[in-house]
Interface confidence: low
């Protein structure tokens, strides 16, 4: 052997393998002839503990009591160190700090599928840190037994690499770990069981989803099995649910009909095996099968609002807009929208498929009476329509609902209320909430929002589509068989100061008096609804305070005239915005002198 | 019957890093401790770092301690010693050796061993 101790020795007493805890006494001891060249008083002999010097010791030998050695394996070394020379390796040894295994528990065997081999796992318990062998064995019928052993560090798992066979489903076997280590042996509980305790089934395979004539409602799982399963158990969920469905079932000769499903839906389908009613196990689950149900035609009815705007003496455009079926409601993909137009005295009718969109514009006379229905298609047929009459929403001034306030609601919301009209509140059968985007000239094109409230409610919050700083107008319409009634206001869900101020365009001279005109501030930099504009003025030259006037904000004005100046007087004139948070910077600044004759 | 042969030695700064390669021929590698030992010039052979069969447990000599990390891979055949922060008395022929028990740190103990290869570390 390489590196023999050729000159010493060193012993342990009373074993190179203890118990912890356990005190053991190290000798080292130089052989003849083997110590310091001269003077054998000399001799210095060292004992180290791995790198560090724990003893020493001037003669031929030196005696160590050595306690306290932590788990595992710790290193001595003996040295010689004589005058004038490097240390000089003697000899070593290990010592090993351990204890005994502990009896192993919970020893389970399993055989994977009707041709795969028994394997049994345990709990060893506390790690023995010495080197512990396992032994399994397996006793069966007819005496016949069979034996694995396992050196590995961490042995907790052996595969006899046996097969156990259906013939006799019923016959015993019986299992057993013993782990054997230098410092004593434990055994585990006997663990007793039959073939069809432990054949846990291959998961099943090749899966299948069936559907007869196209329809969610006639539906069929299929899947393979190995040939002794006897239960199965489905679990299926659609793609985007946390939560299973799960039948039992038994002899299902791997087919099964599932009645439940939604149409237009991925599911996402798993199947378990067992060979018995209640001996053995289930088997992991199969792996997934993903699948979309057939579409079924829609359900539900399209909620649709309108808006009316007048055009000329004999022509009124009406905007159409509804909202997408949610998708329970669609069951498939909506291919298109299927809009009539029927003027109702005459029997006139036009039909038209919108798709892509969910609104649609036309002009139609102002005479007559008029009514749409809409309905949603897709491949396997149509929603059933919602019809409505196209009436003046805002004519009966008697259901228009009063003290509309609109208030902030947290972030992104906006919270109206209103009172019920004077007219008999018992006739309203429902309110709509209508709001859009504020933007100066009524663009028509300005996306329109709208939720329909209970008669008995007077306030709704809105929130869909609303943005911070930017100014909604809210109209609240009672309905009432075909009539309706109005009213208005102005809202946001957040404000601030405008970041800038009108721009005056033009000062004109009328009759002693002057007309302002300015561009209104653009929307993005409104911040919130405008409550007011104010005009200042002061003389070009003077150190005085400017003059003001503060003039209402109406959406449609962008003109207000003065008559407080002086003729013959240069002025300087500027404007600014106000929000319910502040007022803006200036506007641009314009000068101008009053041309007309002084009183 | 189990032969070793080392790679990876060569010169190194002080302060630089090293991987050496145990690499063996049998089948039943995986079964045995894999023991480091290095020797420097006109010195006794010194235990460096043991890894048990299945990589699970390893112990290092103080000297090396928290600067060597033995590592194995039984689908290689191969075990590994990663050797950072070199420093100068470092410098030794370094050598890997195989045995079935794994209780083992001396040099003595073990019954296979490699040829060994040489590594450098300079100032």
């Known amino acids: 052997k390489i590196d023999a101790c050729k000159r010493g020795d060193v012993t342990v007493k009373p074993s190179h393998v203890i118990l912890l805890g356990s005190t053991v006494n190290i000798t080292c001891s130089l052989k003849p002839r083997q110590g310091c060249f001269h003077y054998s008083r000399r001799n210095k002999l060292i004992l180290y503990k791995f790198d560090r010097r724990i003893n020493f010791h001037h003669g031929h030998s030196l005696n160590s009591q050595v306690t306290g050695l932590p788990l595992g394996t710790t290193l001595f070394v003996c040295k010689l160190a004589c005058i004038n020379s490097d240390e000089i390796q003697i000899c070593g040894a290990e010592i090993f700090v351990g204890v005994a295994p502990e009896q192993p528990q919970n020893l389970s065997c399993i055989q994977k599928g009707e041709q795969g081999t028994v394997a049994c796992t345990w709990e060893r318990g506390r790690d023995t840190h010495l080197y512990t062998e396992y032994t399994l064995q397996l006793s069966g019928p007819k005496n016949l037994t069979w034996q694995k052993q396992c050196k590995d560090i961490y042995c907790d798992y052996l595969d006899f690499g046996i097969n156990l066979t259906p013939e006799s489903p019923e016959s015993n076997f019986t299992a057993k770990v013993t782990a054997v280590n230098s410092l004593g042996s434990s055994s585990s509980l006997p663990s007793t069981f039959t073939f069809l305790d432990i054949v846990r089934p291959l998961p099943p395979w090749d899966i299948r989803i069936k559907f007869q004539k196209a329809s969610v409602s006639r539906c069929t799982l299929y899947w393979r099995d190995e040939g002794l399963v006897l239960l199965n158990r489905l679990r299926y969920r659609p793609s985007n649910s946390r939560l299973w469905n799960m039948v039992n079932v038994t002899k299902a000769k791997g087919r099964h009909d599932l009645l439940d499903l939604k149409p237009f839906t991925e599911y996402e389908f798993q199947i378990s095996s067992k060979l018995h009613l209640y001996k053995g196990s289930w088997s992991d689950w199969s792996e997934s099968l993903r699948a979309q149900t057939p579409e079924e035609e829609p359900t539900g009815m399209l909620d649709v609002w309108y808006m009316k705007r007048h055009i000329d003496y004999s022509r009124q455009q009406i905007s159409l807009f509804w909202k997408n079926l949610s998708v329970s409601e669609a069951r498939g993909k909506i291919l298109h929208y299927q809009v009539t137009l029927q003027e109702l005295t005459g029997g006139k009718a036009m039909t038209q498929n919108i798709t892509g969109h969910t609104s649609w514009t036309t002009v139609i006379p102002r005479t007559g009476n008029w009514a749409v229905a809409v309905s949603a298609a897709n491949s396997k047929g149509s929603s059933l329509p919602t019809r409505i009459n196209i009436m003046n929403l805002c004519e009966a001034g008697l259901l228009a609902p009063r003290q509309v306030s609109a208030n902030s609601e947290g972030m992104d919301n906006i919270l109206v209320t209103w009172q019920p009209p004077r007219k008999d509140p018992s006739a309203v059968q429902e309110y709509v909430v209508e709001w859009r985007e504020l933007h100066p000239g009524g663009d028509t094109q300005v996306p329109l929002n709208w939720l329909r409230s209970r008669p008995y409610n007077v306030s709704a919050l809105i929130s869909e589509n609303i943005k911070s700083y930017i100014c909604y107008e809210i109209r609240v319409y009672a309905l009432s068989g075909d009539q309706g009634g109005c009213s208005s206001i102005l809202g946001n869900s957040k404000h601030k100061a405008p970041l800038s101020g009108p721009h005056i365009n033009a000062i004109t001279e009328e009759k002693g008096s002057i007309l302002i005109s300015w561009n209104s501030i653009p929307v993005q930099e409104q911040m919130g609804c405008l409550l007011h504009y104010r005009i200042y003025w002061k003389e070009r030259d003077s150190n005085s305070q400017p003059q003001l006037c503060e003039i209402p904000y109406r959406v449609s004005q962008n003109s207000h005239p003065i008559n407080s100046l002086q003729p013959r007087v240069t002025y300087v004139l500027w404007m600014t915005a106000l929000t319910a948070a502040g007022e803006s910077s200036h506007g641009n600044e314009r000068e101008f002198c009053l041309q007309g004759k002084a009183n | 019957q189990v032969q070793l042969e080392e790679s990876g030695g060569g010169l190194v700064q002080a302060g630089g890093s090293l991987r050496l390669s145990c690499a063996a021929s049998?089948?039943?590698?995986?079964?045995?401790?894999v023991g480091w030992f290095r020797q420097a010039p006109g010195k006794e052979r010194e235990f460096v770092g043991r890894?048990?069969?299945?990589?699970?447990?390893?112990y290092y000599a103080d000297s090396v301690e928290g600067r060597f990390t033995i590592s194995r891979d039984n689908a290689k055949n191969t075990v590994y010693l990663q050797m950072n922060s070199l420093k100068p008395e470092d410098t030794a022929v370094y050598y890997c050796?195989?045995?079935?028990?794994?209780?083992?740190?001396?040099?003595?103990?073990?019954?296979?061993w490699g040829q060994g290869t040489q590594v450098t570390v300079s100032s």
């Open positions: 890894i048990s069969w299945s990589g699970a447990r390893t």
């Open positions: 049998g089948r039943t590698f995986s079964s045995y401790v």
């Open positions: 050796a195989a045995d079935l028990k794994w209780e083992v740190l001396l040099s003595e103990h073990y019954e296979y």
